[in-house]
Interface confidence: medium
């Protein structure tokens, strides 16, 4: 069965407001869920659609949402079908509608002394309250010969007579809102000694130090009396003006005239009219002073060509409104057409390459005129002035591969180098045209390049392949200075690479043949047994037919490697006491001793009172401190190789002799005790 | 996230006017009503209208309507509710909160604006 | 307007006690009833909408129920952090109305 879990209730819904009618249902199988407004299926549209098996309201209309509502659901397999509850809205609004005469029949019949009734036509739901005005002022019931009818939404006048004439307003209110009539009625009851408006003052908005004229006119028997009065209710004559107003000329038709207008006269002025009998009408205008504010710059633009754009033109703050419109060329843009103007927008429909330029915007008022520029550049699809070629590159030099392109706005160009984005570094750089620069080939640039050139319109590539012309080199070069141990086997590798695999020998540099004991091996010197004759100055040749041939000199020295004679030990002193750390080595070059305590190296020229290094390589360390403590390592080195050996030295208090223990009991560690 | 600020507390005379207002960010300010709830001090909520930030058009409670006024300024995403004629019993925080998208109830509340009405 | 009348005015629970508030509509207002929780000198809380519908980050110990003119709040364990003022209102009908308040205690 087709159950409810929440059925949509009636509920108060306000004109214009979203709303949601809620429904929820469960089934044993798949249902769908459709809505009925007065037994007719609710179509979605925008307003008004289904929100799951809710009905929602994006804005609530009295008239198409009046009636009763229906949530139904369906099993479409078995065809069962459940009705929710009905609910309805009880919609709120209220509508602005004018003050109109309703008795009598018609304007031209009302007469001192006789029943005036107004109806004004705001109407809503709930029924509003009403709330009548006389030239703004609000009207109290049963107050000055007039009634009103809440119920019937009249005012009525009996009798109604001059002191009633005046403009004639309403609003209403309700729980919805309020609303004020669209249209007002002004009722005009003549009393020949009232005064009546014939010509009222109108707002102005001048130009600084231009001219500003206010008309004002009153018409009644005797005559009326006329006064002008300026914002602090300063009165203007032509006898006493304030000192702000100086240049203020009051005619006698009742008109105002400033000259020379300055911020100073901006401001309200008032017009009063004074006749025999009832009250002043009090008349106001307000004097603008016309001001244009500076546009703000536009950002260039690029289009594409093809496109739609729009550019809109933010008027300057200004009084009056600035009129905007745009040029190009000098000429103003029409409305219409391919490239026009509308409202504040610069419109550019299927944008040509001729389009392109500079645009402005104008904007104009009493105050001034401003202007400002745009530039529009149509972007193009780059073409190719030089695509990159096939290059061989040489090793070790600067390469060049081209991407010359043009388009509007100039392209970018950026390459790859096995489809990897290539960044500039210190080998690489591409220059404003596009060129790439490889700084010093080296071999494995040999590989694939792609450059693209862009814009926005577009983009174009093109790749190509280097090789690499790979120069004659030793790979890698032979040590100048090598060493080999006296009656030790010994080789000397020499290695190259070029464009063609090269051929390598060795020679002696003083062109001797080599002895038959020293081999030349595909370029390694071979010595089965090095003896003192061996040493000297020896050249490695590589050659091919291409590239001719390089040259590598080696001296080769014969050395007896360092070993030691004599090597420190771990060592043990009492505080105070003298340590000797010794060390002697043996080799050809006759090597030099350094000592490293403590992780630094201690120079023979540097140490102070307390140590010294002999001419054997021992270390004494006079008056042992505990911070003497430590590994100290003795260091043999010749030009031809380097050998350490290390030992740690450990400084104790001395113990003061127990009464058990007799004058000559041996310490429990070995110990240097000077 | 969403965030409603309100601004500090007002002491006012009785018959002044006070100005509060709600800066709303996290959200798109146009999508959700704006709603004013005041709560005196020891007593309970009480709802004083709400307007729709898209279109400028408040609804308020009729208790209100002649003296408050509420209005929104889009370019800043700030909403604000005007009480005229204050009296001594108008002392009360008053909250802006974000309505859901029915403006039915509130998922989101500014911190409150102390306003106290005393001669 | 529809007046929200909520029962009991002031309620102590054991912790880990289920709490029962009550909140009754003076009209049919079908499912349109929200609570919120309030603590002292802090703004209200949501705790449930539409009667009977979850607030994503809210503890699920709260739950709603109820149509027309009755509507419940439960709090199936009170926690010490649940001592609060508890407000439901309705968005059935302009203006919009709030309860009194019901005040939980810790017994």
């Known amino acids: 069965a087709i159950v409810f879990i929440k059925q949509p209730s009636s509920q108060d819904a306000l004109q214009g407001r979203r709303a949601l009618l809620r429904c929820e249902v469960e089934a044993p199988g798949p249902v769908h869920v459709y809505w009925l407004l007065d037994g007719a299926p609710v179509q979605d549209t925008e307003r008004r659609f289904a929100q799951g098996s809710s009905l929602s309201f994006a804005a609530v209309d009295r008239l198409q949402d009046s009636g009763t509502f229906q949530c139904v659901a369906r099993d479409d397999v078995t065809g069962e079908e459940a009705r929710s509850a009905n609910a309805s809205f009880n919609i709120k609004w209220i509508e602005a509608g004018p003050v109109v005469l309703k008795h009598p029949a018609s304007e031209a019949e009302i007469q001192p002394q006789t029943q005036v009734t107004l109806r004004c036509h705001i109407d809503g739901h709930p029924r509003p309250t009403y709330q009548w005005f006389r030239d703004g002022t609000p009207l109290s019931d049963g107050q000055s010969n007039h009634t009103v009818s809440s119920k019937e939404r009249n005012l009525t006048l009996r009798p109604a007579g001059p002191e009633h004439s005046g403009l004639y307003s309403c609003c209403a209110h309700s729980a919805f809102g309020q609303a004020c009539s669209s249209q007002n009625f002004t009722l005009s009851i003549a009393d020949e000694s009232f005064a009546r408006v014939v010509l009222a003052p109108q707002d102005v908005v001048v130009a600084r130090y231009e001219e500003a004229m206010f008309h004002c006119q009153f018409s009644a028997q005797p005559p009326p009396s006329l006064q002008w009065l300026f914002e602090d209710e300063t009165p203007i004559t032509n006898r006493s003006r304030p000192p702000h107003l100086r240049r203020a000329t009051v005619f006698a038709n009742g008109s105002l005239l400033l000259t020379q207008v300055r911020p100073r006269n901006a401001g309200i002025y008032r017009c009063i009219g004074q006749g025999q009998r009832g009250p002043p009408i009090i008349l106001e205008a307000t004097l603008h002073l016309a001001e244009i504010e500076d546009m703000p710059l536009f950002e260039p633009r690029v289009f594409t060509a093809g496109s739609e754009e729009r550019v809109t033109c933010l008027p300057p703050k200004g009084l009056p409104e600035p009129s905007v419109w745009w040029e190009h060329a000098g000429v103003r843009l029409p409305t219409h057409g391919r490239v026009y103007q509308k409202g504040h927008e610069l419109v550019l429909a299927n944008i040509a390459e001729s389009d392109a330029g500079v645009y402005t915007c104008h904007a104009a008022n009493l105050a001034g005129q401003r202007r400002q520029d745009v530039n529009i550049t149509v972007a193009t699809v780059p073409s190719w002035l030089k695509k990159p070629q096939d290059s061989q590159l040489e090793e070790g030099k600067p390469g060049y591969l081209d991407c010359l392109t043009q388009a509007t706005p100039k392209p970018t160009v950026v390459w790859y180098r096995n489809q990897m984005l290539i960044s500039e570094d210190s080998r690489f750089e591409v220059f404003k045209n596009g060129t790439l620069r490889i700084n010093s080939v080296e071999v494995y640039d040999g590989t694939w390049y792609r450059c693209m050139s862009s814009t926005p319109a577009g983009s174009i590539e093109a790749q190509a392949r280097v090789q690499v012309l790979e120069k004659l080199k030793f790979t890698p070069p032979p040590q100048p200075q090598q060493c080999m141990e006296f009656d030790k086997e010994a080789t000397v590798p020499c290695s190259a690479t070029g464009r063609e695999k090269p051929t390598i020998k060795w020679e002696r540099a003083d062109g001797s043949s080599l002895p038959e004991w020293v081999t030349d091996n595909a370029g390694t010197l071979h010595f089965a047994r090095v003896t003192r004759d061996d040493a000297g100055n020896y050249t490695c040749i590589a050659s091919n037919g291409p590239q001719g041939q390089i040259r590598a000199h080696v001296q080769l020295t014969v050395a007896v490697f360092i070993t030691f004679k004599v090597e420190p030990e771990r060592t043990t002193v009492y505080q105070g006491h003298t340590a000797l750390l010794q060390c002697e080595a043996q080799g050809d070059p006759k090597p030099l001793i350094q000592w490293k305590g403590k992780d630094r190296i201690l120079d023979p020229t540097k140490l102070g009172p307390r140590m010294h290094i002999f001419q054997n390589g021992s270390l004494v360390i006079h008056d042992v401190a505990p911070e003497d403590s430590g590994r100290y390592t003795c260091i043999a080195g010749n030009s031809c190789n380097i050998k350490h050996t290390e030992a740690p030295l450990y400084v104790v208090d001395k113990p003061v002799p127990e009464e058990s223990e007799g004058p000559g009991s041996p310490p429990p560690y070995k110990m240097i005790q000077t | 996230q969403v965030q409603l600020v309100q601004s500090g507390a007002e002491v006012k005379k009785p018959g002044a006017s006070v100005k509060v207002s709600c800066k709303a960010s996290?959200?798109?300010?146009?999508?959700?009503?704006i709603n004013w709830v005041r709560q005196a001090p020891g007593q309970g909520l009480e709802w004083m209208g709400d307007?729709?930030?898209?279109?400028?058009?408040?609804v308020y409670n009729q208790k209100f309507m002649a003296r408050v006024t509420m209005t929104v300024d889009k370019s800043i995403n700030t909403a604000y509710m005007e009480l005229s004629r204050l009296r001594s019993d108008d002392t009360a925080v008053y909250y802006c909160?974000?309505?859901?998208?029915?403006?039915?109830?509130?998922?989101?509340w500014g911190q409150g604006t102390l306003v106290t009405v005393s001669s | 307007e529809i007046v929200l009348t909520q029962s009991p005015a002031t309620l102590s629970v054991s912790p880990g006690e289920r709490a029962t508030l009550s909140c009754r509509a003076s009209?049919?207002?079908?499912?349109?009833i929200h609570w919120y929780q309030q603590k002292p000198g802090q703004a209200p809380r949501l705790l449930i909408k539409?009667?009977?519908e979850s607030i994503s980050g809210i503890p699920a110990r709260f739950s709603g129920s109820g149509s027309g003119t009755e509507f419940t709040l439960t709090i199936s364990s009170l926690q010490s952090e649940d001592i609060a003022v508890y407000y439901c209102?309705?968005?059935?009908?302009?203006?919009?109305?709030f309860g009194q308040g019901t005040k939980l205690e810790i017994k």
């Open positions: 009209q049919n207002i079908g499912t349109s």
């Open positions: 539409f009667a009977s």
């Open positions: 909160a974000r309505g859901d998208y029915y403006g039915s109830n509130y998922n989101y």
């Open positions: 209102q309705q968005s059935n009908n302009w203006p919009y109305t």
């Open positions: 996290g959200y798109t300010f146009t999508d959700y009503y």
């Open positions: 307007i729709n930030p898209y279109s400028g058009g408040p």
